[in-house]
Every structure is written in C-alpha cells, then in structure tokens.
Amino acid sequence: CKAMHVAQPAVVLASSRGIASFVCEYASPGKATEVRVTVLRQADSQVTEVCAATYMMGNELTFLDDSICTGTSSGNQVNLTIQGLRAMDTGLYICKVELMYPPPYYLGIGNGTQIYVIDPEPCPDSDF
C-alpha cells in the first residue's frame, strides 16, 4: 500500500499577541489536485476541529471568514497561523491532510504540535 506522511513541528510558542504559526508538510502518494487541511486540537483525549480549508493545488488556501486560522500553501507545504489564542488554549494541535480528488482518497495525520500560550502581564499603573 502507499502511505501518506504528514510532518509538523513538535513545539511552538505563541507570540505575546496570541498568534502561533507552524508548517504542515505532507508527502503525497498521488497527484492530488484538491486537498483539505484541517487543524484539530486534542484535549482530554477528545479531538475537535479548530479550522479547515480546502484548496486546489496551485491556488491559495481559503478559510471561512470567521475562522481563527489563516494560511498559505506552496506545493505540499502549508503554512498555518492560528490567532486569538489565550493561555487556556495551550495544547496539542494536530494537522490532518486529506487528498480529496482525484481518487483514491487518502488521509494523513501529523504527530501534533504542542502550542504554548502565555497571557501577557497587564501593564502596571504608572505614577506620572
């Protein structure tokens, strides 16, 4: 059988503004023209969808308007950015890649990226 491999970094630290970016790269067993990329979060053994986008190879990645994710694609590499993160969102974020068209369908799962989010300290009152 032909296997599909998805690679993503093990750890990412979100910025002080609650933005985290990482690359999701996949080794495709076929020549897909339509690809779906989903970011999932695992918490308490439950895996839930954070955001998803379908794109045609060679075109831009498009998330829904209200999505907290943005991204760009280049060949078999997707650059993902998650915004609006807070400390409580710290966790394991999994990249899922599906080769939708043409058949056969493939699904690949990354090992997950542990994203650490630290809420910024409030600015102290100044005595001016």
């Epitope: 059988c1 032909k2 296997a3 599909m4 491999h5 998805v6 999932l40 695992q42 053994s45 439950q46 895996v47 394991l92 999994i94 369908y105 493939y106 699904l107 690949g108 799962i109 990354g110 090992n111 997950g112």
Partner: nanobody, 115 residues
Framework: EVQLVESGGGLVQPGGSLRLSCAAS????????MGWFRQAPGKGREEVSS???????FYTDSVKGRFTISRDNAKNTLYLQMNSLRPEDTAVYYC?????????WGQGTLVTVSS
C-alpha cells in the same frame, strides 16, 4: 499485509441502532491509526470517527453524542456503536488503518436508515 473486514451493516429504521465491527488480520505494531469513514451515493468519502496516533478520539460534528468508537486490542477489532440513526447516516461505511492515516481499507458495509 493488513486486511480489514467490516460487518454489522444493514437496514434500520430512523432512531434505531447498529454496531459495526472491523476485524483486522496480519496486524502490524506500527498501525497507530484506526478509523471509520462513510461514503454516501454521489458524495466524497468522510471521516466519521477515528482513534488517532496521539491517543485522541475524533468524531465528525454530525455524529457527536450518537456514535461511539472503541477498539479491542486483544481481538484486533474496531467497533462503531451507532445510536439514534438518521436517514442522512445512510452510506457505505469503511474501516481504515495505518501508521499515520489510511494505509489500508476494508471493503465496506452498507448502512441504510429508512422507514
């Protein structure tokens, strides 16, 4: 070579239940992913529920609270308990497995939800 054989499909009335089984043979320790997919006529394949290599459990939104996935490692069998079935659950259900995704597929079992 890993082989997957599904069973348990059939005709059921709306609101009814079915339990699908997927028996795996030639199993490899490197199989970390097992999941259930479905394909309705004229539609693409959809991941319904899976056990991920990270140990987490995934359910697509439309089946949350109705379907339960489980795995019996001693029997090398994956199950999908489907309750409160709806007509829109009608599809061929496939079992898939692999190291990090769908390396192997079963032949599928048909689930029809109709009164």
């Amino acid at each position: 070579e890993v082989q997957l054989v599904e069973s348990g499909g059939g005709l059921v009335q709306p609101g009814g239940s079915l339990r699908l089984s997927c028996a795996a043979s030639g199993f490899s320790p490197s199989v970390n992913y097992m999941g259930w997919f479905r394909q309705a006529p004229g539609k693409g394949r959809e991941e319904v529920s899976s056990i991920y290599p990270t140990g987490g459990t995934f359910y697509t939104d439309s089946v949350k609270g109705r379907f339960t996935i489980s795995r019996d490692n001693a029997k090398n069998t994956l199950y999908l308990q489907m309750n409160s079935l709806r007509p829109e659950d009608t599809a061929v259900y496939y079992c898939a497995a692999g190291k990090y995704g769908t390396d192997y597929w079963g032949q599928g079992t048909l689930v029809t939800v109709s009164s």
